[in-house]
């Protein structure tokens, strides 16, 4: 029985050139993370593995950063990073839990972050 | 068991076009993301393309760019690499291969097609 | 682009002996290097990914290792039906590139 819960940063906006870091907690569970998956729409941003550490999508190389912990740093913001962002965990025994984050890209000089993990 | 069957390939002329497909079964097509990779008659591996499991997303690199387009039907499971203008350099051996779940490697390839240009 | 450089074309081997296959990247690529073999006839089946893990199914006799430009796939005890070509091949960064290849033969 799945007993995890995902918590995220929810939906966070940002400044367009800025960078944001996406966060996922899981808690609730006993269950043994052995990697982390990080897509976007249906990309495939990055790959936290359990053993082997991080590995960036040859796509993102130039704008995405491993951590802080399973999180994952965007850099060099565009309004075209406007969407939705997934964390999925990958547990054993429990299976797949998956978080959602949505991030909306601003042009303006004033972005509100999200409640939890924000930015300082 | 993972298959991939790639099929169309053929004998065509400089400045042709010719349209490959790949077959998959054995897994949940549209959760992967899928690769084209060639191999010349030398017998280096070149990759052509690559598309996202939604289809959202291409990539090449710059020998095909512009003249080759990688898209996918998860509908059919089918996975396509249409080829225009193409050119003798082009004469290969093609193969269509899934991105593993673990990472960014080509996990599994199918038996290839072959293509040849020339006059 | 990354040139992926395996300095040997040809290597000869015994069943029973060792062998390394070494592959040098241009520039740092981390550990985003994956080995693939291929028979004749056949299409390239992957043995190693993430430098250093083994793919489902593939002996444990196959070892990769390395990181940042240089790279090896290890065999260990070799078999006859290791007789193959060994590709490594880059995932760091677009463009995706492979090694030349090495061709493992019996002496």
């Known amino acids: 029985m799945m007993t995890g819960t995902i918590e995220t940063t929810g939906n966070i906006s940002a400044e367009k050139g800025g960078s944001i870091i996406l966060q996922c907690h899981l808690s609730s569970t006993t269950a043994q993370v052995t990697q982390v998956n990080w897509e976007q729409q249906d990309q495939l941003l990055a790959i936290c593995n359990a053993d082997l550490g991080w590995h960036i999508s040859p796509s993102f190389k130039d704008r995405v950063a491993p951590g802080p912990g399973l999180g994952l740093t965007l850099q060099s913001l565009t309004v075209n990073d406007t969407g939705e962002y997934f964390c999925i965990y990958h547990t054993y025994p429990d299976g797949t839990y998956t978080g959602r984050i949505f991030l909306e890209v601003l042009e303006s000089s004033v972005a509100e972050h999200g409640a939890r993990f924000q930015i300082p | 068991e993972v298959k991939l069957v790639e099929s169309g390939g053929g004998l065509v002329q400089p400045g042709g076009s010719l349209k490959l497909s790949c077959a998959a079964s054995g897994f949940i097509f549209s959760d992967y993301h899928m690769y084209w990779v060639r191999q010349t008659p030398e017998k280096r591996l070149e990759w052509v393309a690559y598309i996202s499991k939604g289809g959202i997303s291409t990539y090449y690199p710059d020998t095909v760019k512009g003249r080759f387009t990688i898209s996918r039907d998860n509908a059919k499971h089918t996975l396509y690499l249409q080829m225009s203008r193409l050119k003798s350099e082009d004469t290969a051996m093609y193969y269509c291969?899934?991105?593993?779940?673990?990472?960014?490697?080509?996990?599994?390839w199918g038996r290839g097609t072959s293509v040849t240009v020339s006059s | 682009d990354i040139v992926m450089t395996q300095s040997h074309k040809f290597m000869s081997t015994s069943v029973g002996v060792r062998v390394s296959i070494t592959c040098k990247a241009s520039q740092d690529v981390g550990t985003s290097v994956a080995w693939y073999q291929q028979k004749p006839g056949q299409s390239p089946k992957l043995l190693i990914y993430w430098a250093s893990a083994r793919h489902t199914g593939v002996p444990d006799r196959f070892t990769g290792s390395g990181s940042g430009t240089d790279f090896t796939l290890t065999i260990t005890n070799v078999q006859s039906e290791d007789l193959a070509d060994y590709f490594c091949?880059?995932?760091?960064?677009?463009?995706?590139?492979f090694g030349a290849g090495t061709k493992l033969e019996l002496k």
């Open positions: 091949q880059q995932y760091s960064s677009y463009p995706l590139t």
């Open positions: 291969a899934r991105q593993s779940s673990y990472d960014f490697a080509m996990d599994y």
